[in-house]
C-alpha cells in the first residue's frame, strides 16, 4: 500500500523518489503523475524527466533536489485540497517490465488558523544516511540484466525505517516537514 | 482527423502465419504508444500486444508471447503484427489502438480466421 | 491476473430511463479504470477514462465513478442510441485486462 504524506493548504508539499544512477550523467528517465501508477507510463504526467535533463513539467511542480544524482522527489508549490491524492514516481529503466514504480499518498489538511511556531528541522543533517544505497522490501537493489555496467538501488522512501520510530511521531505531532527521501 | 486502418486479415490453417498491417494518419504517430487488441466472434476484448513510441520496448499478453512479433515504421505511419504458429483460439477480429494504457482511437478491425 | 467482472451481462431498458452499469476487479485497481462503447459490427469507443473522466464527443448523461475494486459507469437518461455493449478495462496491474461486457437493450 502506498505511504501516506502530509502538508498543509498553502505550503509546499514533498514527495520523496530516489535512486542511484552508476555513474554522474547515466540518468534513468522518470515521470511522474497524478494518480496511481498504471501498467505503463505515468498517467496525467506532471513531470518528466529524460536521460538528461527535465523535459517536461506543469507549473507548480519541480525537482528541488539534484536530479542528476538520482533526487526526482517532487516538490508540490503552495498546495490546495484539490491536490490531495495519489502520484506516481516511476523510475523508467531500459528493459521489459523493469520500471520502479511507487505510489505516494498526499493528504492535505486545512491551514492552521493561527499556527503555532514549530521550527523546521532539516530532515538531512538529523538523517545524514538518508541517501545510503540501503535496500528495504520492495526497495532491494536490482541489477539489471539488460544493462550490466548499471545498478539500481530504488529507494522509495524513508519511512520504512521511520513508520514505528518516535521520531516521526514527534516530527509528525509538531507540524513539521517530514523530507522523507 | 485521426484514422487506423487495418489490413492483411485473411482465412489461414493451423500453423500458419499472417502478417497484419495497421495504417495511421491524422496525427503524429511517431509520439504514440500502439497497441493491438482482438475480440473472438461473439466474444469480449483481449490486450494482445503493444510497443512504445520508439519501438524500445514491446509487451505481449502471455498467449501470443514466442509467437506474435510486433514492430513499427514511423517513415511509414505504421504499425505491424506478425503472426506465426497460428492456433484455432487466435481467431478474432484484430483492432490497432492508439494508447499504452487505454485506447483513444481503433481501426475498425480485420478478421483473422484460423481452420483446417 | 486482474479479473475484471461486468454486471449485469444484459441490462433491459427503456429509452429516458437511467441505466447503471456495475464493473469489480479482483484486486485493487486505484482509479486506473476505462469504459467502451461498442456498437454492432463497430470497433469500440473510448468513453471514461481514469474512473470518471468522459472522453471527447460523448455528452455529460454518461458519468464514471469508483475506485479501487468497485466502478459503475451511469447513463442518466438512455437514448436510442446508447443501446450498445460495455466494456471496462483496468489497467493497473500486468496484463492490462477488459471485463466482459454489459449489453444494455432496449426494454
Known amino acids: 500500500s502506498e505511504v501516506e504524506y502530509r502538508a498543509e493548504v498553502g505550503q509546499n508539499a514533498y514527495l520523496p523518489c530516489f535512486y542511484t544512477p552508476a555513474a554522474p550523467g547515466n540518468l534513468v528517465p522518470v515521470c511522474w503523475g497524478k494518480g496511481a501508477c498504471p501498467v505503463f507510463e505515468c498517467g496525467n504526467v506532471v513531470l518528466r524527466t529524460d536521460e538528461r535533463d527535465v523535459n517536461y513539467w506543469t507549473s507548480r511542480y519541480w525537482l528541488n533536489g539534484d536530479f542528476r544524482k538520482g533526487d526526482v522527489s517532487l516538490t508540490i508549490e503552495n498546495v490546495t485540497l484539490a491536490d490531495s491524492g495519489i502520484y506516481c514516481c516511476r523510475i523508467q529503466i531500459p528493459g521489459i517490465m523493469n520500471d520502479e514504480k511507487f505510489n505516494l499518498k498526499l493528504v492535505i489538511k486545512p491551514a492552521k488558523v493561527t499556527p503555532a511556531p514549530t521550527r523546521q528541522r532539516d530532515f538531512t543533517a538529523a538523517f545524514p544516511r538518508m541517501l545510503t544505497t540501503r535496500g528495504h522490501g520492495p526497495a532491494e537493489t536490482q541489477t539489471l540484466g539488460s544493462l550490466p555496467d548499471i545498478n539500481l538501488t530504488q529507494i522509495s522512501t524513508l519511512a520504512n525505517e521511520l513508520r514505528d520510530s518516535r521520531l516521526a511521531n514527534d516530527l509528525r505531532d509538531s507540524g513539521a516537514t517530514i523530507r522523507i527521501g | 482527423e485521426v484514422q487506423l486502418v487495418e489490413s492483411g486479415g485473411d482465412l489461414v490453417q493451423p500453423g500458419g502465419s499472417l502478417r497484419l498491417s495497421c495504417a495511421a494518419s491524422?496525427?503524429?504517430?511517431?509520439?504514440?504508444?500502439m497497441t493491438w487488441v482482438r475480440q473472438a466472434p461473439g466474444r469480449g476484448l483481449e490486450w494482445v500486444a503493444n510497443?512504445?513510441?520508439?519501438?524500445?520496448?514491446?509487451y505481449y499478453v502471455d498467449s501470443v508471447k514466442g509467437r506474435f512479433t510486433l514492430s513499427r515504421d514511423d517513415a511509414k505511419n505504421s504499425l505491424y503484427l506478425q503472426m506465426n504458429s497460428l492456433r484455432a483460439e487466435d481467431t478474432a477480429v484484430y483492432y490497432c489502438?492508439?494508447?499504452?494504457?487505454?485506447?483513444?482511437?481503433w481501426g475498425q478491425g480485420t478478421l483473422v480466421t484460423v481452420s483446417s | 491476473e486482474t479479473v475484471m467482472t461486468q454486471s449485469p451481462a444484459t441490462l433491459s431498458v427503456s429509452p429516458g430511463e437511467r441505466a447503471t452499469l456495475s464493473c469489480r476487479a479482483n484486486?485493487?485497481?486505484?482509479?486506473?479504470l476505462a469504459w467502451y462503447q461498442q456498437k454492432p459490427g463497430q470497433a469500440p469507443r473510448l468513453l471514461i477514462y481514469?474512473?470518471?473522466t468522459r472522453a471527447t464527443g460523448f455528452p455529460a448523461r454518461f458519468s464514471g465513478s469508483g475506485s479501487g475494486t468497485e466502478f459503475t459507469l451511469t447513463i442518466s437518461s438512455l437514448q436510442s442510441e446508447d443501446f450498445a455493449v460495455y466494456y471496462c478495462q483496468q489497467y493497473n496491474n500486468w496484463p492490462l485486462t477488459f471485463g466482459g461486457g454489459t449489453k444494455v437493450e432496449i426494454k
Open positions: 484486486q485493487n485497481v486505484y482509479s486506473n
Open positions: 489502438a492508439r494508447g499504452s494504457n487505454w485506447f483513444d482511437y
Open positions: 510497443i512504445k513510441q520508439d519501438g524500445s520496448a514491446k
Open positions: 481514469d474512473a470518471s
Open positions: 491524422g496525427f503524429t504517430f511517431s509520439t504514440y504508444w
